[in-house]
Amino acid sequence: EAHKSEIAHRYNDLGEQHFKGLVLIAFSQYLQKCSYDEHAKLVQEVTDFAKTCVADESAANCDKSLHTLFGDKLCAIPNLRENYGELADCCTKQEPERNECFLQHKDDNPSLPPFERPEAEAMCTSFKENPTTFMGHYLHEVARRHPYFYAPELLYYAEQYNEILTQCCAEADKESCLTPKLDGVKEKALVSSVRQRMKCSSMQKFGERAFKAWAVARLSQTFPNADFAEITKLATDLTKVNKECCHGDLLECADDRAELAKYMCENQATISSKLQTCCDKPLLKKAHCLSEVEHDTMPADLPAIAADFVEDQEVCKNYAEAKDVFLGTFLYEYSRRHPDYSVSLLLRLAKKYEATLEKCCAEANPPACYGTVLAEFQPLVEEPKNLVKTNCDLYEKLGEYGFQNAILVRYTQKAPQVSTPTLVEAARNLGRVGTKCCTLPEDQRLPCVEDYLSAILNRVCLLHEKTPVSEHVTKCCSGSLVERRPCFSALTVDETYVPKEFKAETFTFHSDICTLPEKEKQIKKQTALAELVKHKPKATAEQLKTVMDDFAQFLDTCCKAADKDTCFSTEGPNLVTRCKDALA
């Protein structure tokens, strides 16, 4: 229904706390360089204005759209051009072009320092001093670094953070209580960020239809007892929620997500038998829980998929009458039978099925033509299954760090022109798939591996889009979203690449590396490894292992030495010489 004042409506629906949190996230995602204090001031002004509209919906400007209200606030920020350059040009436009312009200026890789977690004691002191301001800083710091983070989900992570601090700051050993818990939240939040960015990419590049297909497959796997009409309704609603969040309409997104959670909990009987525990939780936890609820038990009496989609004499007629609905039912039926497949694979199969019908229904004898379509799915299914087996075997053999290094070598050979920091980040993220997925039961591995890899590769594509340097990467990133992972997997050594000349300074290290945390040490070593591959793209695994073992030994020796600086300055050049010889 239409409301006289949109801002009053959203304030009433969401409540002050969530309203303020979402407005802070929205501003932080649009203007990523502004400080927390600057944004907090704007949030307070918007909230005060919303309250006047709640009191009197006819008050001045209360009838304006949220984009107009928020955009006007952002455009009133002093020194906008000095701090944000051409983003300031957005302010010369009218809505809806102005909001589109802001969206286009979101930076997926902002030049902000990595957020270092402060010491436990200091965190607890400042959290106790002002929990609201502390959590505001958390929202701001995450949102500006992840401009497409799913806003209602970020509120959920902030709530988790708050609960952890409340619990651990009361403990004697705050550090050992906080560290594992906050590490867990951070890991989950980072995965959530790349997954949501993938959804927004799908929406931006291929439109709502592509996202809705993703949603149908995912929901059908999770709720195999729901009928097609129910799945379609859920997919339509979920598409709307995601479109709003990806489009910066965070208040609407959070409000609609709450409505969707409410609907699901009120209609459990027709959706799934697994929802009750989620539905007993408060709002943020409920919506989060529903988004990752376990798959319902598959109906025992499902007929073979071939009956309706291959053997039926009316296949072409049914397809011609309503293509999207027919393909939707195929995707639904296939997905509910295959919780063990990745969504990407299910969408590739649906695409193959569509292409087969397009070709065969134009021929003289369609059934003879499309009769083998299910058999033609086999290679498409085998490819990711083999990928999972090969990579999980390698992960089990090498462990996470060694597996990351193997991926780093592989991807540096595929795209040596890509910057070393991007390659290292990508390889570290891709390598985490082992820890995340390879320990799962067999039937959960494939969906976990492939859908996670697809999300990470989407980030590689976004970073590469900014400064395209590799034709290999451009080729894989230009195609459809579901074909990206197979495309990257199929890439081999880039034969067009002219190896980098050997620079001794790239492999020169100083004693400060000894005091770095383990993660930073790994990144330094992985940076050196990528540079080695760029110097010798065709180096064998054995050669690279020799060099890296030597390098690790050198670090170990010099970091244990009484005079570290002398050790690094004398042994370092010897290491560089040995490396050159080993790779000659």
């Epitope: 010491e119 004691e121 002191t125 001093e129 002002n130």
Partner: nanobody, 116 residues
């Protein structure tokens, strides 16, 4: 790497005012309590003032109470010390310090000379 850079010191007459600044980098400034510490010529270190993460709590040495005001701007990662009614005994090198946490970090100091 943590860096603290003080500025604003100089020569001032008794009864005059100065405002010291400390630009912080290399750590999450808004989470930490910050302090000012001074060292008069030939003397030991003397704690002057401290401020909590969000500025809600401030503490002062008795010798400066009512004359000095500590403040911070978390959006600029900067700590301040407003010094009024300066006396000859306030002459010292003033250090900005991050004393909470596992390690202490100090700036290189800024010299304040109060003399007629």
């Amino acid at each position: 790497e943590v860096q603290l850079l003080e500025s604003g010191g100089g020569l001032v007459q008794p009864g005059g005012s100065l405002r010291l600044s400390c630009a912080a980098s290399g750590f999450t400034f808004w989470v930490y309590q910050m302090d000012w510490v001074r060292q008069a010529p030939g003397k030991g270190l003397e704690w002057v003032s401290s401020i909590s993460a969000f500025g809600a709590k401030t503490l002062y040495a008795d010798s400066v109470k009512g004359r000095f005001t500590i403040s911070r701007d978390n959006s600029k990662n900067t700590l301040y010390l407003q010094m009024n009614s300066l006396r000859a005994e306030d002459t010292a090198v003033y250090y900005c310090a991050k004393l909470s946490g596992k390690f202490d970090y100090w700036g290189q100091g800024t010299l304040v000379t109060v003399s007629s």
